[in-house]
């Protein structure tokens, strides 16, 4: 079979062979090669040379096949808008930014561009656990059976009920969703003022 | 109006040198790729030389490769053709046309050719 | 010898149509566009078709120009005698950066 065309080469129906690595130039009605991430076009195209590329300046990135004439300037992570870093700005991409902990991103535009508190999850309830953290605010959920979660808090978790044999206890109240088991000494009858907690 | 003006032909002996320059007008000349062209008495056209629209590449033909040399001054829109170690089968009308649907895909009114200049090498 | 091949002589009458070749290879033809020159007796040569097919303005709708693969075709009708001139193929090859024109076809009008 014969060589594929090498950039650049005429092309009547507007298309070119490889999309991701070239472009059509209406001027002069041609495909030229795309400049790889990291780089920007330095020199247009024409019908007898190929794109010309450079290396992004520092401070700056182009993250795609592009022809570009310029690159993209890195931003910080705006702590403002609640934003931390977990990957600096390089010539191939730009810097990777998230929500701080205990918040949810608000506004997403291609990315997050600002974050917010995430809600208080009551006692008796967790919240639901995300496939990715500061994705969304949380969705509270009832403790599952023989656990339980005694705060308003936006991170806790529901934790197991004291299982009162374990400690050489006896069950002086059992746990509900929002409180533990309590739990006594077996030979020591539990004084009313005691009542709700555990002792030892 | 587009034009291109050669000149700077005439005879010289085997072995010596000429200069041929192209002036340029009705145009910018700094954004175009620029060209040499021959045509021996009664033969075809031949391509001699091409120079990009910043001079920063040169192309020749075989047969002219280390005697010729293009080059461009585009703060006085002028191409260059020096000729040295001349022969006489270099004997031919030369021209600077543009070229540009070749080179460019410019089309409009772009693709001129000036009168050119005669170049008799004999003894 | 040229790059691009062209019939050195095409000859026809008057009023008729006739059709000039110019072949090469993928380098020049097939991945670039072609431009065609006339050169009338006695002048300089003249943009007749550009980018395989297309006309400059001024240039009447007798004269056209198709591309299939690496060939392209010059085709002139109703024939007159002032189209009697040379007629050059030229593009780019980008295998040897240079321009390349066919040796030329003579048009006789009989």
């Known amino acids: 079979s014969q060589p594929q065309a090498v950039p650049p080469y005429a092309s009547e129906n507007q298309t070119c062979r490889d999309q991701e690595k070239e472009y059509y130039e209406p001027q002069h009605r041609i495909c030229c090669s795309r400049c790889p991430p990291g780089t920007y076009v330095s020199a247009k195209c024409s019908r007898i040379r190929d794109t010309v590329c450079a290396t992004c300046a520092e401070n700056s990135y182009n993250e795609h096949w592009n022809y570009l004439t310029i690159c993209q300037l890195c931003r910080p992570c705006d702590p403002v808008m609640g934003l931390e870093e977990i990957a600096p700005c390089t010539s191939k991409r730009k810097t990777q930014c998230r929500c701080q902990p205990g918040m949810f991103c608000a506004a997403w535009a291609l990315e997050c561009t600002h974050c917010e508190l995430l809600s208080d999850c009551p006692p008796g309830t967790e919240a639901e656990l995300k496939d990715e953290v500061g994705k969304g605010n949380n969705h509270c959920v009832p403790c599952k059976a023989g656990h339980f979660q005694n705060t308003s808090s936006p991170s806790a978790r529901c934790q197991p009920h004291t299982r009162c044999e374990n400690q050489g206890l006896v069950e002086a109240a059992p746990g509900t969703a929002q409180s533990d088991t309590t739990c006594k000494n077996p030979l020591e009858p539990l004084p009313p003022e005691m009542s709700g907690t555990m002792l030892m | 109006q587009v034009q291109l003006v050669e000149s700077g032909g005439g005879v010289v002996q085997p072995g010596r040198s000429l200069r041929l320059s192209c002036a340029a007008s009705g145009f910018t000349f700094s954004n175009y790729d620029m060209h040499w062209v021959r045509q021996a008495p009664g033969k075809g056209l031949e391509w001699v030389t091409t120079i990009w629209y910043d001079g920063s590449n040169k192309y020749y033909a075989d047969s002219v490769k280390g005697r010729f040399t293009i080059s461009r001054d585009n703060s006085k829109n002028t191409l260059f053709l020096q000729m040295n170690s001349l022969r006489a089968e270099d004997t031919a009308v030369y021209y600077c046309p543009t070229l540009s649907t070749v080179t460019t895909g410019d089309y409009y009114g772009m693709d001129v050719w000036g009168q050119g200049t005669a170049v008799t090498v004999s003894s | 010898q040229s790059v691009l091949t062209q019939p050195p002589s095409v000859s026809a009458a008057p009023g008729q149509k006739v059709t000039i070749s110019c072949s090469g290879s993928?380098?020049?033809?097939?991945?670039?566009?072609v431009s065609w020159y006339q050169q009338l007796p006695g002048t300089v040569p003249k943009l007749l078709i550009y980018?395989?097919?297309k006309r400059p303005s001024g240039i009447p709708d007798r004269f056209s120009g198709s591309k299939s693969g690496t060939s392209v075709t010059l085709g002139i009708t109703g024939l007159q005698t002032g189209d009697e001139a040379d007629y050059y193929c030229g593009t780019w090859d980008s295998s040897l950066s240079a321009v390349v024109f066919g040796g030329g076809t003579k048009l006789t009008v009989l």
């Open positions: 980018d395989n097919s």
């Open positions: 993928r380098s020049n033809i097939g991945n670039n566009y």
